[in-house]
């Protein structure tokens, strides 16, 4: 083990605490330790030990209370099905090793629901869904027996109940009791039996949390969404006059630690961003707690629905804020939430009964003071009139999600607090904060949001194309003339926007290579569409060798792009997608978008360049205020433009200008950057405002970007606001919703 055997800060010696086949780490300043085993193994007989006041570590006891002398890492097994009704499973075994498979089939007259084949996974869980053999005779369908659980009750009439139990030493997650309800659904959520070493993987959590959260926030017609024989999912009609309050509750107690606290904040920032991407504007409440809670944002505050402002408040919270009182009083924290929800007797606010409440609690586990927090959940249910009226139980109006982080999490406690809804999961246990951060990065990019423009996956594990998923590389092969390299941007499933000068009229479609998402394969081109006003030779007679006005082109692809984390569109100006991305009202006009994106001042923007096979973002300032004139005048230093008398001959109103040294020294574009997007990054979204066209100085001679460049090194980009009619016409079938 990596520890010296000196006494930790607590009072227990580390002698003899080693685990065979693994290591351990100290928690809570030496007051506890966690055994760590390699993947596919678990610590036997316990995962954690606590330092007792007597100066000795808690004893190693098995589930049937036998004492073990030394801890060891044992191979993870998956539980066997205790019972399987109305069918058979094969092979039968007392336990199953990782990657073992079992298959289920039903007796005659019964139909299989769920997964016919299931595999034992590395975390000790079976893949797939609970297999159920049902003959459809009950009012409710057979709720099944999740592997590892035992079920009592086999009548499925209206108001019949079934109960579930776990073997000794395992903890039940989900609902212990489920009741057959009107409409044929079961109350609560499917149970499972958890061993202490079991964690949810980030992918599992992201999928389950998001599918539940999406049910809560997406306004979908209650009548839609299920075919005959399918169970209807919880879909809520989001009444336009209804609203949503999201309460973020963050454990800041001693045991969390500063880095975990920072990680949890990052997660919540991602969550706020995710919710905003759906186009809903909930009000946020923000509470951190230790011995006492601290309310940072009240849902009643005017700015509580301003995602940017709430994010700012969240980022400003300091772990030290709870330093002096560092117990874990979850009950008081939830009471703070209750106080934000409540109102005086008989004076509910307008729309109280249309407001949905979501509580997201992140904790490392044990409340050690203040009493049982479940009583406050009951009070909240009472206040919101949930579960009182059988005809209208209003369960959809409260969702409590609990994220337990780390080995000390008390599964019984967190399960008790979390909501229990059919086909949904509200309680999650993740291994550590890094895993939880993964959850929220995965969550922010699930398939439902893939078509959202200008979204990126800013994750520490992300590749270049996760961070610039719109970026396209273009090369044109010209026999005997070498090849031309350009960039472009994915703007829809069929189109890449680039510069017209990357091509000549002689270039054939098959000689144009386009790749996206960092993939090696090239995409087939159907056609290149030039702006009709583009003519590079248009002013040759006037002594202007190259004229780049309207230097834009659209490449139409033969096959539809499959969006994913590394391929997705950038936002275009004056589209509904950009209105949503900028969180502007739906009534926003094109002019208002322009004022938001290109105000008359220096505008912070960026372009993406390839350096040593890596994509890097370069920050520049669009000179759109008092520096605009001097920026444009520097075009006279461009080769071939020195004789131009009036610079507006070459710098038309179609161009945006970057570069120079004021307000900051801007990096310059290189030849290979042509056609790439000039981007404004706002509210965590990326909106293309220009197409890189030409530069005054070639700062990249000899394949190397020069460090020292003259102050007149400017770059010119086609302003997309100036070519909107053409974009609108060519992209009319792409569902971009041009304003």
């Amino acid at each position: 083990t990596p520890w010296s055997l000196a006494r930790p800060q607590g009072s227990c010696s580390l002698e003899g605490v080693e685990i065979k086949g693994g290591s351990f780490r100290l928690l809570q300043e030496g007051q506890a330790l966690e055994y760590v085993c390699p993947s596919g193994f678990y610590p036997y007989p316990v995962q954690t030990r606590t330092c007792r006041s007597t100066g000795s570590w808690s004893t190693l006891k098995t589930q049937d209370q036998k004492t073990v002398r030394k801890a060891e890492c044992r191979a993870i097994h998956c539980p066997r099905p205790h019972d399987f009704e109305n069918g058979e499973y094969w092979p039968r075994s007392p336990y199953y090793n990782v990657s073992d498979e079992i298959s289920f089939h039903c007796y005659d007259g019964y139909t299989l629901r769920g997964s016919a084949n299931r595999t034992c996974q590395v975390n000790g869980r079976w893949s797939g869904q609970t297999a159920i053999c049902d003959n459809g005779a009950g009012y409710c369908s057979n709720p099944g027996i999740p592997i590892g659980t035992r079920k009592v009750g086999s009548q499925y009439r209206l108001e019949d109940s079934v109960t579930y139990h776990c073997s000794r030493g395992l903890t039940l997650r989900g609902s212990q009791r489920r009741t057959c309800q009107e409409g044929g659904s079961w109350s609560g959520t499917e149970p499972s039996c958890q061993d202490s070493f079991m964690y949810d993987t980030p992918q599992e959590v992201a999928e389950a949390f998001l599918s539940s959260l999406t049910e809560t926030i997406e306004g979908v017609d209650a009548e839609d969404g299920h075919g005959p024989g399918e169970q209807q999912k919880r879909k809520i009609v989001l009444d336009p006059s209804g609203s949503m309050n999201i309460y973020l509750v963050l454990d800041g107690s001693d045991s969390i630690g500063a880095s975990n606290f920072t990680g949890a904040k990052k997660c919540l920032v991602n969550l706020i961003e995710k919710v905003a991407s759906y186009g809903v504007k909930p009000r946020y409440g923000l509470v951190t707690y230790a011995t006492y809670p601290k309310i940072w944002v009240k849902v009643s505050e005017a700015d509580s629905s301003n995602a940017d402002w709430v994010t700012k408040q969240l980022n400003e919270i300091n772990y030290e804020d709870h330093k002096l009182k560092s117990g874990t009083n979850t009950k008081k924290a939830l009471q703070a939430v209750y106080s934000m929800m409540s109102w005086p007797d008989d004076v509910p606010p307008e729309g109280w009964n249309r407001t949905r409440h979501v509580i997201i609690l992140m904790t490392d586990g044990l409340h050690n003071m203040g009493g049982d927090p479940i009583t406050v959940i009951d009070e909240i249910r009472d206040l919101l009139y949930i579960g009182k009226d059988r005809k209208n139980p209003r369960e959809d109006y409260l969702d409590v999600y609990v994220f337990g982080v780390g080995p000390l999490v008390n599964q019984v406690n967190i399960n008790a607090l979390a909501s229990k809804k059919d086909n949904e999961q509200h309680v999650f246990k993740v291994k550590d904060m890094e895993n939880l951060e993964d959850v929220f990065y995965q969550m922010i990019d699930e398939s439902q949001s893939l078509s959202l423009c200008g979204m990126v996956w800013e994750h520490r594990k992300g590749t270049d194309y996760h961070k610039q998923p719109w970026q396209a590389k273009i090369s044109v092969i010209r026999p005997s003339k070498g090849h031309e390299s350009c960039m472009g941007a994915v703007v829809s499933e069929y189109f890449v926007l680039t510069a017209a000068h990357c091509f000549t009229v002689d270039d054939k479609e098959h000689s144009i290579k386009v790749s996206v998402g960092g993939e090696k394969r090239d995409l087939e081109i159907e056609v290149v569409l030039f702006h009709p006003n583009y003519n590079i030779n248009g002013k040759k007679e006037a002594g202007i060798p190259e004229f780049y006005d309207y230097d834009v082109a659209l490449i139409k692809l033969k096959n539809k792009l499959k969006y994913g984390q590394t391929i997705r569109p950038i936002c275009l100006p004056c589209t509904e997608g950009t209105t949503r991305a900028l969180r502007l009202p739906p009534t926003t006009t094109c002019q208002q978008q322009k004022e938001e994106l290109l105000p008359a001042q220096d505008i912070k923007a960026l372009f993406v360049s390839e350096e040593e096979k890596k994509l890097t973002r370069k920050e520049v300032y669009i000179k759109n205020g008092d520096k605009k004139g001097s920026c444009e005048r520097d075009a006279q230093y461009a080769p071939g433009y020195d004789k131009v008398k009036d610079i507006s001959e070459v710098v038309t109103p179609r161009f945006l200008c970057t570069g120079g040294v004021s307000p900051y020294a801007d990096p310059n574009t290189c030849r290979g950057d042509s056609g790439g997007p000039l981007i404004v990054h706002k509210r965590s979204r990326f909106i293309q405002v220009g197409v890189i066209s030409w530069g005054v100085v070639d700062v990249c001679k000899n394949q190397k970007r020069q460090k020292q460049v003259p102050a007149h090194a400017r770059d010119f980009h086609i302003n997309l606001f100036q070519v909107l009619p053409w974009l609108k016409e060519k992209l009319q079938d792409e569902d971009l919703g041009f304003l």
């Epitope: 934000m340 008989d346 004076v347 509910p348 606010p349």
Partner: antibody
Amino acid sequence: EVQLQQSGPELVKPGASVKMSCKASGYSFTDYLMNWVKQSHGKSLEWIGRINPYNGDAFYNQRFKGKATLTVDKSSSTAHMELRSLTSEDSALYYCARLENDYGFTYWGQGTLVTVSA
Amino acid sequence: DIVMTQAAFSNPVTLGTSASISCSSSKSLLHSNGITYLYWYLQRPGQSPQLLIYRMSNLASGVPDRFSGSGSGTDFTLRISRVEAEDVGVYYCAQMLERPWTFGGGTKLEIK
């Protein structure tokens, strides 16, 4: 248009009872709490109590418990208040008022004048 | 019960000038949800009361924006920016934080 139409003035003897009405129209009667407010001559307003027309639940100001009884007739969208064991102290103008969430008493009836005199 | 206190008469005002009416409560009317449950009503001569301001500072529907409400948890002010003849009457403040809901004694707006 929302209207609360109250019954006419009442002249009653001490010790007797009186039952006044407040007929609601122009909105869904069961969606809003109906309140009753007393205004003695030249004096301020005093909240008597409220009734929930949806389920008939009533809540009273302690000062009026045993004095006032609030009821509703959903079929006619009418709220009633009965005052018993009347004394000269009960001579006043009585208003019904609709409570709209936390917006306050947004609609008021025109008032029913009760005069208690031997 | 929460006691609401008002002066019986306002200082006489000239039409077209501004007027302020004060009210205080025996307990803070600020709820833990951040809302202050203070209301203003006007009763014109011979009429039923009419809601002017709800939750301390929100203008009720149909009320001219000459009226505005402000205050802290216990001290409140109704301001009329340009008094008109139709503003004459008795102004009541009321609280809806705790039952029984209570009204102030009323302040009569006097015109010079």
